[in-house]
Interface confidence: low
């Protein structure tokens, strides 16, 4: 066992926001996502707009703990999910062998110092394979209907094209601009630079020396220590609390 009070304290850590501090950060998530039964999905969150140090990230489904990534201790996957949950990429979580029961809300809870706790929400819908197939079939007539509608619209447009050419051009430009902005916005969101091998905390968020190396030995031991999680967090013999 490589840590003492640091562990129990840093891990038992429940970080509340500082009363005096402004929580400026924001959590960006993959939002609402769907996947096929039997498949896999990556849950991804990203904390931005804050210089706070990420001490730990919890992944929870409703009130069930899935996994923890602790800056000092590395990853811990809850025993009941070990077969189907894989850490990463980065601070994300990969769910495998999805079942319909996996449908629901997932939360990434970032414990930071000194800001406190940030929570992101992702809604996952797991679809039956057959439902997904039916959905694809229904899309064909739907596309046909859309095409017919477009033909009608185009005809109408052609009738008035001479009168509205200038306005139409402006309108198309505006729409293209909006689309471009949305696209750019989506590109802006991406997980931070990959962490060093074995690392769980973003390179820019972790203080020097934290999580920069594989902590396999510690993590293996942790399986003996991590029991039932009651709320949304951990501390260190200082491990029973936090690491400053």
């Amino acid at each position: 066992m490589r840590w003492c009070l640091l562990l129990i304290w840093a891990q038992g850590l429940r970080q509340a926001p500082l009363a005096s501090g402004m929580m400026t950060g924001t959590i960006e998530t993959t939002g609402n996502i769907s996947a096929e039964k039997g498949g896999s999905i990556i849950l991804q969150c990203h904390l931005s707009s804050t210089t706070a140090q990420v001490t730990q990230v919890n992944w929870e489904q409703q009130d069930q703990l899935l996994a923890i990534c602790n800056a000092d201790l590395g990853w811990h996957i809850s025993p009941s999910f070990k077969d189907r949950v894989a850490p990463g990429p980065g601070l994300g979580l990969t769910l495998q062998s999805l079942t319909v029961n996996d449908t629901g809300e997932y939360f990434c809870i970032y414990h930071t110092y000194p800001d406190g706790t940030y929570t992101g929400r992702i809604f996952l819908e797991v679809l039956e394979s057959s439902v997904a197939e039916h959905g694809a079939r229904f899309q064909i007539p739907l596309l046909g209907a859309m095409a017919a509608t477009l033909v009608v619209i185009c005809t109408a447009v052609i009738v008035v094209v001479a009168l509205t050419r200038k306005k139409k051009a402006l309108r198309i430009h505006s729409v293209e601009g909006d689309l471009r902005r949305k696209s750019a916005g989506q590109e802006e969101w991406s997980p931070s630079a990959p962490s060093p091998p074995g690392s769980c905390v973003q390179a820019e968020a972790a203080p020097a020396g934290l999580c920069g190396e594989q902590r396999g030995e510690d993590c293996a031991e942790l399986h003996d220590y991590f029991n039932v999680l009651s709320y949304r967090s951990l501390g260190n013999c200082s491990f029973f609390t936090e690491t400053g």
Epitope: L5, L6, G235, S238, G244
Partner: antibody, heavy 121, light 112 residues
Amino acid sequence: EVQLVESGGGLVQPGRSLRLSCTASGFSFDDYAMHWVRQVPGKGLEWVSGISWNSITIGYADSVKGRFTISRDNAKNSLYLQMNSLRAEDTALYFCAKDGGNRKYYGMDVWGQGTTVTVSS
Amino acid sequence: DIVMTQSPLSLPVTPGEPASISCRSSQSLLHSNGYNYLDWYLQKPGQSPHLLIYLGSNRASGVPDRFSGSGSGTDFTLKISRVEADDVGVYFCLQALQTPCSFGQGTKLEIK
């Protein structure tokens, strides 16, 4: 008033079991890590075990690993130490202690008065 | 495991005089976060221990400023600027960096 009260100590034969309890009052028990520390009369202090506020992290001294189990019930403001396969060398005064901080380490800032465990045939 | 060694084991002091206790660890207690995970506790006769200093040099709440902690890495010192009769007891250092946490053997301070 912040207070920790240990109970459950007593005389027990070698190889038998005993369960110590520590009841907390005067603070938000579920916010803090807790520890068990023991002291052989007239001797020094020995850290026995510690547990994070949410039971996620648990640690043991090598001398008790595999025999003692620490646990807590936040709803009851209680800390426990299940001691199995007791040995004569486990005879001591057992203190429970509160961790001082829930954001940064602040030492063990509150201690109980202790409960005596005597292992003898 | 980290071994903590205190000296002296016995310290007779005249009231009003300063006192100094040394604690040495077998490994550095300086964490990468910049903190030294070393505490000092005082156990008065017939009482439970109580916290004096945490993280090497931080005085616990209610502890008189006569007490100060210093040091880094493996060598630490607890100083009492002016000893009072109420300061008698056994002083313990504790390393809180690695599990298992470990205490020093204790230094018994007594009044001359």
